[in-house]
Interface confidence: low
């Protein structure tokens, strides 16, 4: 018995061939011997089966001795043995129809679980293997689960259903809702304007939800909400904003915040969360602000940084075009009785300068100038 696998919602064509290459009488029946369709001369006739409005044949092939049964918009319950009667012969074809669906929405938050459920006809024992867009392989039976979805899981999942050594392939598009970056760090000199951007890693026609940015300043004992906002069809409207700092938020995506001045008291870490309508859970992005200040007080030239710096970062003070006078893996360095000239304070990581601040030291009878 020939086995044919079909996909729910698809169209399948079951073949039936006579030895005579001409139009002769044929009938297609199901396993209950109920006629589905056949011919009377050159006319297509249909029986009382439940496939009535979804069954068809190709009259153009009858003259060649081919009498296919076409079933449109396949349903799991169409799984059956179909019998073609032609020339006193019976050809049997077993049709097995499978469906594969995602548990809920195909738009899932990063960290959530994806469950794929296989609909299969009674008596079948299929196995399923799915390959994620990043090449991960998942195998299972009637259900497959993937926990802790990552951004790289966005895209087309290709699932192969295997039954009776036959395969049928399903493609399911999954969108993992996340920010492009889990974390970002901004380095600024004291007084500079700060721009925070939170680009999303997905696009949808309508995006509605609400969000907030909580900030933990390095100098503060507890975090505070800097801003809360609503998102309606990709339009941003601020609900509440802290008075200090005076944050501004862009009205369009990507989510964009401006801090007018980088000050030591603002240095620290923030967590932006976004709750999307009709989704449980939230999207998160961490953002960090490092602020540098170079000052001269009496005979002491000091360079300081505030905020979340890694222990391997180097802070240096050097006179322009000269060797560093002082270089330490610390958050503050200083030089006593600095020579007159343009001094540079550098924050660097493995030789790469992340932040630079210049201060002009004048001869001792003058006051310092910060360019």
């Amino acid at each position: 018995k020939k086995v044919v696998l079909g996909k729910k919602g698809d169209t399948v064509e079951l073949t039936c061939t006579a030895s005579q290459k001409k139009s002769i009488q044929f009938h297609w029946k199901n396993s209950n011997q109920i006629k589905i369709l056949g011919n009377q001369g050159s006319f297509l006739t249909k029986g009382p089966s439940k496939l009535n409005d979804r069954a068809d044949s190709r009259r153009s092939l009858w003259d060649q001795g081919n009498f296919p049964l076409i079933i449109k918009n396949l349903k799991i319950e169409d799984s059956d043995t179909y019998i073609c009667e032609v020339e006193d012969q019976k050809e049997e074809v077993q049709l097995l129809v499978f469906g594969l669906t995602a548990n809920s929405d195909t738009h899932l938050l990063q960290g959530q679980s994806l469950t794929l459920t296989l609909e299969s006809p009674p008596g079948s024992s299929p196995s399923v293997q799915c390959r994620s867009p990043r090449g991960k392989n998942i195998q299972g039976g009637k259900t497959l689960s993937v926990s802790q979805l990552e951004l790289q899981d966005s895209g087309t999942w290709t699932c192969t259903v295997l039954q009776n050594q036959k395969k049928v392939e399903f493609k399911i598009d999954i969108v993992v809702l996340a920010f492009q970056k889990a974390s970002s760090i901004v380095y600024k000199k004291e007084g500079e304007q700060v721009e925070f951007s939170f680009p999303l890693a997905f696009t949808v026609e309508k995006l509605t939800g609400s969000g907030e940015l909580w900030w933990q300043a390095e100098r503060a004992s507890s975090s505070k909400s800097w801003i809360t906002f609503d998102l309606k069809n990709k339009e941003v409207s601020v609900k509440r904003v802290t008075q200090d700092p005076k944050l501004q938020m862009g009205k369009k995506l990507p989510l964009h915040l401006t801090l007018p001045q980088a000050l030591p008291q603002y240095a620290g870490s923030g967590n932006l969360t976004l709750a999307l309508e009709a989704k449980t859970g939230k999207l998160h992005q961490e953002v960090n602000l490092v602020v540098m200040r170079a000052t001269q007080l009496q005979k002491n030239l000091t360079c300081e940084v505030w905020g979340p710096t890694s222990p391997k970062l180097m802070l240096s003070l050097k006179l322009e075009n000269k060797e560093a006078k002082v270089s330490k893996r610390e958050k503050a360095v200083w030089v006593l009785n600095p020579e007159a000239g343009m001094w540079q304070c550098l924050l660097s990581d493995s030789g790469q300068v992340l932040l630079e601040s210049n201060i002009k030291v004048l001869p001792t009878w003058s006051t310092p100038v910060q360019p």
Partner: antibody, heavy 120, light 111 residues
Amino acid sequence: EVQLVESGGGLVQPGRSLRLSCAASGFTFSNYGMAWVRQAPGKGLEWVATISYDGSITYYRDSVKGRFTISRDNSKNTLYLQMNSLRAEDTATYYCTREEQYSSWYFDFWGQGILVTVSS
Amino acid sequence: DIQLTQSPSSLSASVGDRVTITCRASQSVSISSHDLMQWYQQKPGKAPKLLIYDAFNLASGVPSRFSGSGSGTDFTLTISSLQPEDFATYYCQQSKDDPYTFGQGTKLEIK
């Protein structure tokens, strides 16, 4: 220590059959996909077939589809390659490989290889 | 099928040299920023040995003088300081698409 030992190679006439075996040890065989990779004398490497950890899914290169069958017996920690309708171009050293399937797909352990010669 | 082209096909070098082998794919082997490219080393009469997976990850037990880089269609295997045991043939391999394909190989010989 991971070990893969192939057997069953030799000289065979075109059109005939041969079955290669690969005995695996040193790892949980039933947790890993396995594959066969071949190398014609003096030539490069060519992937032949892959089988999933439980044997439910198999993949073949087009030139061997319908002629070769990859299978496994997890209770015996053994991988097989049944080769039918052999052709001269199937002459090669056949390597049994363990296929890591959790990130990229790659062959992290290889057997020493077994020579299959198809000639009349 | 994805074709992989290695260059050079053969290369003569001395112990201590820095050597670079490139592999170009006929189409991208990246999936969601994940590069499905491997490098193997094969010595005469021996089975291949995995050196690098996912374009840049060093396989277990492989010396740190070997490194991989690249993304999309262009990949590089670098040996920072050749050792006598490194003279062999090197193959790149993609596993983005069925069938998995290998480069034609680069034979590294002693100068």
